[in-house]
C-alpha cells in the first residue's frame, strides 16, 4: 500500500490519505460590477457569484468580499478567465493623430494576499495590447497554474479596467481554485 | 489518518478513498471535420480523435458521437483549446468599403447536455473579435474550469464556424476532462 | 473502502493508494534567457528558474537543463504561459510596402523528449499570427493538457523567437506540471 | 420532423414480460436522452427509467429497478423498454420521452393492458 | 425518493381568471417543470428551469420559486386551458410528478 510505511504486523503507519471529494474546491461567475474605490496604483479586484448557476464552494474553501479564502495548506491549481470587450481603443485613435503609440492594454492578475505579509503576492499575471483598428472588440485571457499556498491566504482577480469587464455571462469570466 | 474516523480500535472506518489511477480521464484531439447538420441557433460541434498520437479515454470515461459522457458523478477539470485561421476578417473589409464595422468574431463554447435539462448549458466560452487589418490570421482560443458533473452528462466542445478550425495538428486544437 | 478488493475477513488488498501531498509537482518561472545555440528547423527551448519566489519542484520531479524529469509514470497535467512583447510586427511593414501579407506569429511548443523515441513529440501548441498596425505589443499564450507520461520523459517548453519573451516577471511567463 | 412513435402489443398476460419499442425520427437520438414514463388509469405520471442512446448508459426508478430493462438500437434509431413479471398494476398508456439538449418531445402514448 | 406535493388537485376558475397552482418538494430542487396534459394526449412541456417558457407556449403561463416552493400561473385563463397540470424535479433518483392538478372553466 503506497502511503503505509513498512512497521511490525501489529502497527500499521499512514500518510494522511483523504477522500478527493472533500478537498476545497470553488468555482466562480462574474456578476455585474458595482463601482468601489481601489488603492492608487493597485487595480481593482473584481466580486464573483458563489452560488448560484455554475458556481460553487466546498469544503470549507470560501468567498467572502471579493477573495477566495484558503481553509488548509497545500498546492492548488488556481485559474481565471476574464473577458473584456470595449469600443474602438485610443491606440489607433492616438496613432492616426500622430501622437504617441503607446498601445491600450487589458491586464488580469491574480494575487495572493497573506496577513503575514505586507504587499500582495502577483501570481499569474495576463496582459495584452489592444490596438484594434475600428470597431467594438472583445477578447478573453485565460490563466492558470499551481501554486503552495497557506491556510489563511486568500485570492483575488485584478483587472486594468474593470469596465470593460464581460459580466453579461457565468460562462465568459470566471475565477476557480482547487487543492490537488 | 485523515478519511479514517475515529472509532474503538478493533473497528476501522474509512472515507471513501480511491486510487487517482482509475478516475475517469480523457483527451481528445482535432480530426478533419465532416460537415454535418446541426440545429438553427446552435453552433456546430466538432468531432474528435479519441485513440489515436495523444488521444485516449479512460476509467469508463466515453467519447462517443462528438460527445465525452461523463461516467460518475463528481468535480471534474474541463479544457479545450482550439485554433482558429482565416483569410482576411471581413471586417476589415467591410471597414474599407466604408460599411458598418461590426468585427467578425471567433466563439469556442464548452456545453454540457444533461438529461435533466432540456437546454444545453453553456459551462465555459471564450469569444475573440477577429479584425485583422490584412493578411491570413490564426489563433488559439484556450478554455478551462473546473464543473460539478452528474452521471450520465454529456459535455461537447461548439464552434462559431467550423471551417476556421485547424484540424492539421493534434497539439493545436483539443479537448480535454478528468475526474478530480 | 473503495480501493480495497473483496478477499477473505483476515486478508486485506488495496489498490495504490497515495497521499495527495507526495505526488511529483513543479511551477517554474522565467528568467533571462542566455542566447544558446538551438536545431536548424526547432525552436528554442526555454530555461527556467526552479527554486525561487513562485517556483518549486517536489517529490522527484526535477528541473534541469531546460528539461523537466518525469520522475513516474501516469497522467499529469501540463501548463505554461508565454508571454511575448515586441515592437510594429514585419507584417504591417510588409503589406505597407506592397510585398507578400504573410503574417508574423508567435508560437510557445510543449515538448515531450523520450529516450527511447528519436523525434520529440510536441504535445501543445499556441499559435497566433502577429499583425499590429503599429506601436508596440504585447500578449501572452496560454496552453495547458493532460497527458500519459512515463518515467524518465523530459518535458521543455520551445518558443519561435526567444528574443520576443517577457522575462521581466515570474507571473507573466511560466511552466507546469503536476501527477494528476 | 421530430417523432416519437410507440409500439408494441396492447395485451399481455400476467407474469409475462411487456415489450414496446419507440422509433425516433427527424433528429439524432445520441444528442438526447430517452426515457419512459408511463401513465396507469386515473393516476399520474410514473419515470421510470431513461437511457443515454450514444453509449447505452441506463437510470432506473428504484422502485422498477429489478423488472425494467431499457435498450437502444441507434441503426434503427429506436429504444426499447421490457418490463417483467407484469401484474394487472402495470396497466397504463406507456410514453416514450426525449430529454437534453433539445426540447422535450413525448410520444402519443401507447395503451397497454395486463389480463389473463 | 422526492415527494412533490401539488395543490389544489382541482380548481375551476372563469375565463379571464388569474389561476395559480403551487408544488411543494420534499427537499430542495434546483429546477421544476411543468406540463399541462389533455384527455386523451399526451403531456406537453409548458416551463422548464422553474421559470422559463418552453418554445411555442403562449406567455399567459409562467412559473417562478426556487428550492422547495415553486409556482404555475396563468395570467388569464382561456377555454383551451382546460386540462391536468403537473410538476415535475428531474433531479433526484427517480423523478417524480406531482399528482396533478385539473383545471376546469366555471
Known amino acids: 500500500l503506497k502511503g503505509q510505511e513498512f512497521a511490525p504486523s501489529h502497527q500499521q503507519v499512514y500518510a494522511p490519505l483523504r477522500a478527493d471529494g472533500d478537498k476545497p474546491r470553488a468555482h466562480l461567475t462574474v456578476v455585474r460590477q458595482t463601482p468601489t474605490q481601489h488603492l492608487k496604483n493597485q487595480f481593482p479586484a473584481l466580486h464573483w457569484e458563489h452560488e448560484l448557476g455554475l458556481a460553487f464552494t466546498k469544503n470549507r474553501m470560501n468567498y467572502t468580499n471579493k477573495f477566495l479564502l484558503i481553509p488548509e495548506s497545500g498546492d492548488y491549481f488556481v485559474y481565471s478567465q476574464v473577458t473584456f470587450r470595449g469600443m474602438t481603443s485610443e491606440c489607433s485613435e492616438i496613432r492616426q493623430a500622430g501622437r504617441p503609440n503607446k498601445p491600450d492594454s487589458i491586464t488580469v492578475v491574480i494575487t495572493k494576499v497573506t496577513d503575514s505579509y505586507p504587499e500582495p503576492t502577483q501570481l499569474l499575471m495576463g496582459t495584452k495590447s489592444v490596438c484594434e483598428v475600428g470597431s467594438n472588440w472583445f477578447q478573453p485571457i485565460y490563466l492558470g497554474a499551481m501554486f503552495s499556498l497557506q491556510e489563511g491566504d486568500k485570492l483575488m482577480v485584478n483587472v486594468s479596467d474593470i469596465s470593460l469587464v464581460d459580466y453579461t455571462k457565468e460562462d465568459k469570466t470566471f475565477f476557480g481554485a482547487f487543492l490537488l | 489518518l485523515k478519511g479514517q474516523e475515529f472509532a474503538p480500535s478493533h473497528q476501522q472506518v474509512y472515507a471513501p478513498l480511491r486510487a487517482d489511477g482509475d478516475k475517469p480521464r480523457a483527451h481528445l484531439t482535432v480530426v478533419r471535420q465532416t460537415p454535418t447538420q446541426h440545429l438553427k441557433n446552435q453552433f456546430p460541434a466538432l468531432h474528435w480523435e479519441h485513440e489515436l498520437g495523444l488521444a485516449f479515454t479512460k476509467n469508463r470515461m466515453n467519447y462517443t458521437n462528438k460527445f465525452l459522457l461523463i461516467p460518475e458523478s463528481g468535480d471534474y477539470f474541463v479544457y479545450s483549446q482550439v485554433t482558429f485561421r482565416g483569410m482576411t476578417s471581413e471586417c476589415s473589409e467591410i471597414r474599407q468599403a466604408g460599411r458598418p464595422n461590426k468585427p467578425d468574431s471567433i466563439t469556442v463554447v464548452i456545453t454540457k447536455v444533461t438529461d435533466s435539462y432540456p437546454e444545453p448549458t453553456q459551462l465555459l466560452m471564450g469569444t475573440k473579435s477577429v479584425c485583422e487589418v490584412g493578411s491570413n490570421w490564426f489563433q488559439p482560443i484556450y478554455l478551462g474550469a473546473m464543473f460539478s458533473l452528474q452521471e450520465g452528462d454529456k459535455l461537447m466542445v461548439n464552434v462559431s464556424d467550423i471551417s476556421l478550425v485547424d484540424y492539421t495538428k493534434e497539439d493545436k486544437t483539443f479537448f480535454g476532462a478528468f475526474l478530480l | 473502502l473503495k480501493g480495497q478488493e473483496f478477499a477473505p475477513s483476515h486478508q486485506q488488498v488495496y489498490a495504490p493508494l497515495r497521499a495527495d501531498g507526495d505526488k511529483p509537482r513543479a511551477h517554474l518561472t522565467v528568467v533571462r534567457q542566455t542566447p544558446t545555440q538551438h536545431l536548424k528547423n526547432q525552436f528554442p527551448a526555454l530555461h527556467w528558474e526552479h527554486e525561487l519566489g513562485l517556483a518549486f519542484t517536489k517529490n522527484r520531479m526535477n528541473y534541469t537543463n531546460k528539461f523537466l524529469l518525469i520522475p513516474e509514470s501516469g497522467d499529469y497535467f501540463v501548463y505554461s504561459q508565454v508571454t511575448f512583447r515586441g515592437m510594429t510586427s514585419e507584417c504591417s511593414e510588409i503589406r505597407q510596402a506592397g510585398r507578400p501579407n504573410k503574417p508574423d506569429s508567435i508560437t510557445v511548443v510543449i515538448t515531450k523528449v523520450t529516450d527511447s523515441y528519436p523525434e520529440p513529440t510536441q504535445l501543445l501548441m499556441g499559435t497566433k499570427s502577429v499583425c499590429e498596425v503599429g506601436s508596440n505589443w504585447f500578449q501572452p499564450i496560454y496552453l495547458g493538457a493532460m497527458f500519459s507520461l512515463q518515467e524518465g520523459d523530459k518535458l521543455m517548453v520551445n518558443v519561435s523567437d526567444i528574443s520576443l519573451v517577457d522575462y521581466t516577471k515570474e507571473d507573466k511567463t511560466f511552466f507546469g506540471a503536476f501527477l494528476l | 420532423q421530430v417523432q416519437l412513435q410507440e409500439s408494441g402489443p396492447g395485451l399481455v398476460r400476467p407474469s409475462q414480460t411487456l415489450s414496446l419499442t419507440c422509433t425516433v425520427s427527424?433528429?439524432?437520438?445520441?444528442?438526447?436522452?430517452m426515457h419512459w414514463v408511463r401513465q396507469r388509469p386515473g393516476r399520474g405520471l410514473e419515470w421510470m427509467g431513461r437511457i443515454e442512446p450514444a453509449a447505452g448508459h441506463t437510470k432506473y426508478n428504484p422502485s422498477l429497478k429489478s423488472r425494467v430493462t431499457i435498450t437502444r438500437d441507434t441503426s434503427k434509431n429506436q429504444v426499447s423498454l421490457r418490463l417483467s413479471s407484469v401484474t394487472a398494476a402495470d396497466t397504463a398508456v406507456y410514453y416514450c420521452?426525449?430529454?437534453?439538449?433539445?426540447?422535450?418531445?413525448w410520444g402519443q402514448g401507447s395503451l397497454v393492458t395486463v389480463s389473463s | 425518493d422526492i415527494q412533490m406535493t401539488q395543490s389544489p388537485s382541482s380548481l375551476s376558475a372563469s375565463v379571464g381568471d388569474r389561476v395559480t397552482i403551487t408544488c411543494r418538494a420534499s427537499?430542495?430542487?434546483?429546477?421544476m417543470y411543468w406540463y399541462q396534459q389533455k384527455p386523451g394526449k399526451a403531456p406537453k412541456l409548458l416551463i422548464y428551469g422553474a421559470s422559463n417558457l418552453a418554445s411555442g407556449v403562449p406567455s399567459r403561463f409562467s412559473g417562478s420559486g426556487s428550492g422547495t416552493d415553486f409556482t404555475f400561473t396563468i395570467s388569464s385563463l382561456q377555454p383551451e386551458d382546460i386540462a391536468t397540470y403537473y410538476c415535475q424535479q428531474w433531479e433526484g433518483n427517480p423523478r417524480t410528478f406531482g399528482q396533478g392538478t385539473k383545471v376546469e372553466i366555471k
Open positions: 427527424g433528429f439524432d437520438m445520441g444528442d438526447t436522452y
Open positions: 427537499q430542495g430542487v434546483e429546477y
Open positions: 420521452v426525449r430529454s437534453g439538449g433539445l426540447p422535450d418531445i
